[in-house]
């Protein structure tokens, strides 16, 4: 199939960093500068992304595939191939319309993205607060209250060492 | 043709002032948040600061906040940023922004300024 297919489209024989010019006999010539294309049997090259502005350039482009932006420090990418950045915040912070807010009490955000979450609540796994929330921190939950009632040890002290073949004396 | 014109840069000793202006031709900034960039030699571009498009509200780097000023005169169709306090850290290419959805986010078809040099001597 493929032998009869290069035969009627001679176009499918040029590889991916060419272009199939019908202004030159369809033949297979290079992507001109700034272009590319990633596959075999283009008619055209695509023009290479630019990285402006607040975009910054990830991975060069080349002649069979295109340029990968990032964004510029304090901001983030968003969308499918970082299409738009956003702002950054500090951890204990969530973007808002109003700019970067600092987290509602009992929640937080450990991020410089995101939206502030609540803290865990330890009592639904029957778990004591171990150490409190912050803006920037999760609780940390520890054992259960009733693990830490007067008297009882959270930690099981280890067995006495036997030798073997011994009785404890 | 749509453009963004930065205006106002120059020479400053540290701590003097200087105003940018930043004048819109082709479209009307009334409708977009105007945001200022300033890249230094070597650096990457940093955000300066931002005004919105709806109730001029303003926003500001750490670096800059209590020193510069974004202010805007839609009848004018100019965004300004009045820097005073210079130091020679504040030494870049300024450039003006106007993003399409707002001051926090930046998009690859917004328009930007060919930026205006701002050099602070000690």
């Known amino acids: 199939f493929e032998r009869t297919r290069s035969l009627q489209d001679p176009c499918s024989n040029c590889p991916a960093g060419t272009f199939c010019d019908n202004n030159r006999n369809q033949i297979c010539s290079p992507c001109p500068p700034n272009s590319f294309s990633s596959a075999g049997g283009q008619r055209t090259c695509d023009i290479c992304r630019q990285c402006k502005g607040v975009f910054r350039t990830r991975k060069e482009c080349s002649s069979t595939s295109n340029a990968e932006c990032d964004c510029t420090p304090g901001f983030h990418c968003l969308g499918a191939g970082c299409s738009m950045c956003e702002q950054d915040c500090k951890q204990g912070q969530e973007l808002t319309k109003k700019g970067c807010k600092d987290c509602c009490f009992g929640t937080f955000n450990d991020q410089k993205r995101g939206i502030c979450r609540p803290w865990t609540n330890c009592s639904l796994d029957g778990k004591s607060v171990l150490v409190n929330g912050t803006k920037e921190r999760d609780v940390v939950c520890g054992p259960s209250p009733a693990d830490l009632s007067p008297g009882a040890s959270s930690v099981t002290p280890p067995a006495p060492a036997r030798e073997p073949g011994h009785s404890p004396q | 043709q749509v453009q963004l014109q930065e205006s106002g840069g120059g020479l400053v000793q540290a701590g003097g002032s200087l105003r940018l202006s930043c004048a819109a031709s082709?479209?009307?900034?009334?409708?977009?948040?105007i945001g200022w960039f300033r890249q230094a030699p070597g650096k990457e571009r940093e955000w300066v600061s931002c005004i919105t498009a709806s109730d001029s509200s303003a926003y500001y780097a750490d670096s800059v906040k209590g020193r510069f000023t974004i202010s805007r005169d839609n009848a004018k169709n100019t965004v300004y940023l009045r820097m005073n306090s210079l130091k020679p850290e504040d030494t870049a290419v300024y450039y003006c922004a106007a993003p399409r959805s707002d001051c926090f986010h930046y998009g690859e078809n917004d328009y930007w300024g060919q930026g205006t040099q701002v050099t602070v001597s000690s």
């Open positions: 082709g479209f009307s900034l009334d409708y977009y948040a």
